[in-house]
Amino acid sequence: QPSVSPGEPSPPSIHPGKSDLIVRVGDEIRLLCTDPGFVKWTFEILDETNENKQNEWITEKAEATNTGKYTCTNKHGLSNSIYVFVRDPAKLFLVDRSLYGKEDNDTLVRCPLTDPEVTNYSLKGCQGKPLPKDLRFIPDPKAGIMIKSVKRAYHRLCLHCSVDQEGKSVLSEKFILKVRPAFKAVPVVSVSKASYLLREGEEFTVTCTIKDVSSSVYSTWKRENSQTKLQEKYNSWHHGDFNYERQATLTISSARVNDSGVFMCYANNTFGSANVTTTLEVVDKG
């Protein structure tokens, strides 16, 4: 519990005075927050938050879903917390099944435990399928299992959180990992034709093809030495995972002599940029 120095605001004090508390399902949770400037209790687990303005938090019959962090806050904005596990042999995991990971970053499989004293808290592949040999994780009973350094090859991986209970593996609901790729190269850009010679009044149409690992690649047609916004149309396709193609078509329905010049198709992602140009020459009808 926090020590009090006179004159200086101190955090509230919680009874029982431990950082973690384990109660059995069906038992009572009784938490007392002592502070002259008590404001509220806050309960958090996964994406759920509840508040209580009473300084004593009482849950008469605890359920697994009462597992979480209970924080008492005072009028100075100072707080103190206790984490409560509600041990329920029938519900070992709380689960949020959304699972997205950015390539090369860590991502959290949100399956916190209701009992921190179980063993072999780990990940298992669905239907007995093996997990990638290089997959590594950091377990945290209060948060879930953090997959380290997500690889592109983990995309669409089906997995369960797993613990051992009385000599048997118990699995959580299944998770499907969706991996957002990291840009590791500049976009690949190409143009349908490098140069055009048209008569005035003819239609100018040119297509730029942009290829990258995801649709978040940025692309635009620009006219060199001009700020004018050009009219372009897009078509796009996903050719399987991490193989995205966009076609940006620039059209001038009736080309004029002063439309002559260099047009650049520019694309960029977080790794860098690439461009390709096409030259238009418009001659008068004579």
Epitope: L131, L135, I138, P139, P141
Partner: nanobody
């Protein structure tokens, strides 16, 4: 570079107890995992137990569950293996292993640990 030094091995009667220690030099991060493996003469190295450094979650082989307990002392950078109700088939050289990249999905696979101690002999007589 991590150095691991085991101690606590010895000769014990069946049904007796021993406590092995493994001291790690250098700083242990939250991604750390430390484990115990054993190798009996003519047999492959087998997983015994492991512990994650950050939350202290524990992992056991079925053959030792309920008899052996793995624990850690963060301040001393040391992992312990308390072995109770020892059997003659527990006789082996016990190795401490560590890795800084997190718990392997296949935490019982010795090939997935980067650092190893020299081993300490445990002999259980009948």
């Amino acid at each position: 570079e991590v150095q691991l030094v085991e101690s606590g091995g010895g000769l014990v009667q069946a049904g007796g107890s021993l406590r092995l220690s493994c001291a790690a030099s250098g700083r242990t991060s939250g991604s750390y995992v430390m484990g115990w493996f054993r190798q009996a003469p003519g047999k492959e190295r087998e997983f015994v137990a492991a512990i994650s450094w950050s939350a202290g979650m524990t992992y056991y082989a079925d053959s030792v569950k309920g008899r052996f307990t793995i624990s850690r002392d963060n301040a001393k950078n040391t992992v312990y293996l308390q072995m109770n109700s020892l059997k003659p088939e527990d006789t082996a050289v016990y190795y401490c292993a560590a890795d800084q990249r997190g718990v392997p999905a296949y935490y019982s696979d010795y090939a997935l640990y980067d650092y190893w101690g020299q081993g300490t002999q445990v002999t259980v007589s009948s």
